[in-house]
Interface confidence: medium
């Protein structure tokens, strides 16, 4: 049945899906706070632009008794149930914010006539790439893949003089939603990462990972994994590690590395951490004070989703254009808008671009230091520390295959 959009005559509504199954175990109250803070900012911006309109959010909750696993495994049905609720109510906002689980986003995208934009804080998987009316405000797996391939190929920096073409990927199935899809993308045989590497093996057991650390016959010195330092410690403990092993720890949504008093534990010396450049003002913002460093990005994505809608609404209203058109639904891409914490850029497919940061542990100071940054928008690496105090021999990253000379 045709669902009418509450999206005209000076009144514009945002439908926010509040799903029990979520990419991050964040209390829904925190997400509500983020949305409400975003609404306040949007109203102010519209008023400053001389646009006297009303913008509100409707929070749509699913039945917690049915969908209560709390993770993304049962999210497909929950997403569709929420769509049914919208259909039954015959009422929809100008834009749908949520869901965050890849399964539910993919299914909802398939099962809806998408004449409205969908904004997601999550939906990390490759199956959500290149969707015409979907915008993703947290770095999707495709962006990670492009960084890794770029970094593997780099061979002209003082600290990385070898191109790499091999890797182990540790994936044991207990990962968080973001890690699950990041590693899934690296594992997929048809992905860009797999296509560009000559050798790649997925390690699924703790023992496999532990054995590789000192295995003289290993096929690669590089191991990619996803999670925080504690996750690595549980797995690696204080085991000895061969001197030319490099562990790449993907931990994008974790600001802790940048806090002043953080000292890197000894087990991190063979590790390069890939994370996102921290925001400027987020640590002090009212909505984020109660959030852990890993959750800030999730709540921020909800807030930025509201600001993105406000940005597009302002543009369309100023141009005298209709909001309930396919043009509006397809417009949430290839743009930069003023986010809560500075400019946010979306690529041609509506996926957020960001600055990824590769950190190493300084053997001198035991602090995390920035080795290089990577701009996902232009797929380009920018070195920061040209003389890193690495644990690796000659302060250079080793070759990815033991015993292989310069390429």
């Amino acid at each position: 049945s045709q669902v009418s959009q509450n999206c005209h005559n000076g009144s514009y509504e945002i439908s926010v899906l509040m799903m029990g199954n979520s990419a991050f175990a964040e209390p829904l109250k925190n997400l509500e706070d983020a949305v409400n803070e975003g609404l306040e900012i949007v109203r102010g911006r519209l008023q400053n632009a001389g646009l006297n309109v009303t913008v509100n959010a409707t929070f749509m909750y699913s039945d917690g008794l049915i969908h209560n696993s709390g993770d993304c495994r049962s999210s497909t049905c929950e997403g569709l149930d929420l769509l049914r609720k919208i259909s039954n109510a015959q009422r929809m906002g100008c834009v749908l914010i949520g869901p965050s689980c890849t399964y539910s986003t993919f299914q909802m995208y398939l099962d809806t006539e998408l004449s409205y934009p969908m904004i997601s804080a999550g939906s990390f998987g490759l199956s959500c790439d290149y969707k015409e009316t979907l915008t993703r405000l947290m770095s999707p797996a495709r962006k990670l893949m492009y960084f890794l391939v770029n970094f593997w190929k780099t061979n002209d920096l003082p600290f990385k003089t070898y191109s790499w073409s091999t890797s182990y990927v540790y994936k044991n199935g207990t990962e968080t939603e973001d890690c699950f899809w990041y590693l899934n993308a690296l594992e997929a045989s048809v992905s860009y990462f797999s296509h560009e590497l000559g050798f790649k093996v997925v390690l699924r057991q703790d023992k496999e990972f532990q054995d590789i650390l000192m295995d003289h016959n290993r096929k690669s010195n590089v191991i990619i994994m996803c999670g925080g330092p504690e996750f690595l410690y549980k797995l690696k403990g204080d085991r000895a590690v061969a001197e030319d092993i490099v562990i790449i720890l993907v931990d994008l949504f974790n600001d802790q590395y940048f806090e002043d008093n953080v000292t890197a534990p000894d087990y991190m010396k063979n590790v390069l951490v890939l994370t996102l450049s921290p925001g400027n003002s987020l640590l002090n913002s009212s909505f984020s004070r109660n959030l852990s460093p890993t959750k800030r990005d999730f709540a921020l994505a909800y807030l930025n989703g509201i600001l993105l809608f406000g940005h597009m609404l302002k543009i369309f209203l100023e141009n005298g254009e209709n909001i309930t058109t396919p043009k509006f639904a397809h417009a949430f891409r290839n743009l930069t808008f003023e986010g809560y914490d500075g400019p946010v850029t979306l690529d041609d497919w509506g996926d957020v671009d960001s600055t990824m940061v590769l950190l190493y542990t300084s053997v001198d100071t035991k602090k995390y230091k920035v080795l290089l940054t990577y701009d996902t928008h232009v797929n380009k690496t920018y070195p920061v520390d040209m003389s890193p105090t690495f644990t690796w021999k000659n302060s250079k990253l080793p070759n990815d295959i033991t015993g292989r000379g310069p390429q």
Partner: antibody, heavy 122, light 110 residues
Framework: EVQLVESGGGLVQPGGSLRLSCAAS????????MHWVRQAPGKGLEWIGE????????NVHEKFKDRFTISVDKAKNSAYLQMNSLRAEDTAVYYC???????????????WGQGTLVTVSS | DIQLTQSPSSLSASVGDRVTITCRAS??????????LQWYQQKPGKAPKLLIY???KLASGVPSRFSGSGSGTDFTLTISSLQPEDFATYYC????????FGQGTKLEIK
């Protein structure tokens, strides 16, 4: 001696195409980002795009993406700028330059070619 | 793109004068403790020549009468005592996000 030499400029009609070449010598070509920058008569400098010869990664400014393509031939130590659908406003001196990354991690254009003039006119 | 605005657009001065040109960026060009801003000199019919990189570092072979300062969004190029060969057009350039140039400052003999 580090040197960049552009060639291929000349007179072309509106709607026409032209391919500019930049021959590099005196340095390890594949390790540097190579750029094209243009300057219309009496105007300022405008960055067009860049290419990394080692992996042929390119970035072209949004303004030129539809019409201009940058490529390299590593065997010839040369970068190229293919310009299609040329307009009168593309009339300019086209320079080839490279980015150096210093040991402190700064990057900038340190070596430029002499430039080649492209005139688009009927 | 980061916009760079130079002032003045043109300027007349005499040999021996102290000259200052400013460049303002639309957003910060700072990057992990340094400023990714350069100054170039260009003479008619010639390619630009690098003078200053990272806001204040003198490029190889450039006379010490040239100096640069600033950080964030505001930068200055100073020529302490103008020489006849310094009359040219000067451009600032940022390499923080892609590459953009200022519109140029033409330095003429008074």
């Amino acid at each position: 001696e580090v040197q960049l030499v552009e060639s291929g400029g000349g007179l072309v009609q509106p709607g026409g195409s032209l391919r500019l070449s930049c021959a590099a010598s005196g340095f390890t070509f594949s390790s540097y980002w190579m750029h094209w920058v243009r300057q219309a008569p009496g105007k300022g400098l405008e960055w067009i795009g860049e290419i990394k010869p080692s992996n042929e990664l390119t970035n072209v400014h949004e303004k030129f993406k539809d019409r201009f393509t940058i490529s390299v031939d590593k065997a010839k130590n040369s970068a190229y700028l293919q310009m299609n659908s040329l307009r009168a406003e593309d009339t300019a001196v086209y320079y080839c330059t490279r980015t150096i990354i210093t040991t402190e991690g700064y990057w900038f254009f340190d070596v430029w070619g002499q430039g080649t003039l492209v005139t688009v006119s009927s | 793109d980061i916009q760079l605005t130079q002032s003045p657009s043109s300027l007349s001065a005499s040999v021996g004068d102290r000259v200052t040109i400013t460049c303002r960026a639309s957003e910060s060009v700072d990057y992990y403790g340094s400023s990714l801003l350069q100054w170039y000199q260009q003479k008619p019919g010639k390619a630009p020549k690098l003078l200053i990189y990272a806001a204040s570092k003198l490029a190889s072979g450039v006379p010490s009468r040239f100096s640069g300062s600033g950080s964030g969004t505001d930068f200055t190029l100073t020529i302490s005592s103008l020489q006849p060969e310094d009359f040219a057009t000067y451009y600032c350039q940022q390499t923080r996000k892609a590459y953009t140039f200022g519109q140029g400052t033409k330095l003429e003999i008074k």
